[in-house]
Amino acid sequence: APISSHCRLDKSNFQQPYITNRTFMLAKEASLADNNTDVRLIGEKLFHGVSMSERCYLMKQVLNFTLEEVLFPQSDRFQPYMQEVVPFLARLSNRLSTCHIEGDDLHIQRNVQKLKDTVKKLGESGEIKAIGELDLLFMSLRNACI
């Protein structure tokens, strides 16, 4: 299996009750606006074929996509949560900037691409869905990276 390096986040990033609560509140607000409950972005298909040691790298890719293609374009919505959560997630992304995989990551890119394609295909409702799954993103990052 490919070796991942620098793919770690300190546990303290996920032990801040205020920002954790705001992240979950943002996800809840967005999920109320999400009418497409049949499609899931962060689920078994995303992790399929990805070993436990590769998952932080996987979630880094998902986090970066979510920030750049979803949260930044939608930054005026779901206030006041968005203005607090986006900088927090951006900091996590920055801390994972040196997280890389040595070796073939094609299987990971394939899974991430499917998630990206789903969001793009659904348009704005896909972006809303991605925001509604920020709680899953948060938990996946925590479980994979600490």
Partner: antibody, heavy 119, light 108 residues
Amino acid sequence: QVQLVQSGAEVKKPGASVKVSCKASGYTFSDYYIHWVRQAPGQGLEWMGWVNPDTGGTRYAQKFQGRVTMTRDMSISTAYMELSRLRSDDTAVYYCARDLTGFDPFDIWGQGTLVTVSS
Amino acid sequence: SSVLTQPPSVSVAPGKTARITCGGNNFRNKRVHWYQQKPGQAPVLVIYYDSDRPSGIPERFSGSRSGNTATLTISRVEAGDEADYYCQVWDFLTDSGSFGGGTKLTVL
């Protein structure tokens, strides 16, 4: 095929400890979290916590914090759940189960281990 | 007591449809899973992510969700479906797995 096989029934005295094992086969042990769930006689299911076999990281239900220890031995694809300071109301069937992310459904379960706490 | 509310028992005649509900707060962005447990056996996953069915589970089993209530529907009920059924979600705020109290399905 994919399966989780647990150790046999145990009878313990109050105040003692018990250690239940869960041996995985048919899949890559390190790629799935192992959860522990218990069921008292005639009662419902109660989640106790999980262990990440890859890192050894754990997450315990608040109710069991300080009394439960979940570990694993990668070399033999086995997870363990140790419960200390046993009380009579710890009498239950203890199940291990696997999940993919740490918060996904439990798709494979062990057969269960009956732990009886009696003086 | 459980944060997920299930009816203690549901009775149904063979060939009819059984519906078992599971209610909880802030269900909207949680994923509900359902397990079947027969006496003396370990639970078996029958529905996950609200409505997905694992391989090997008959199509008669389906799941749905509306607001704060999830429903497990078993159509054309058979005697072999008699069991306890549990719903489950992951509660992110307490970071724990929560089960409903269970529903005993009796086939008349």
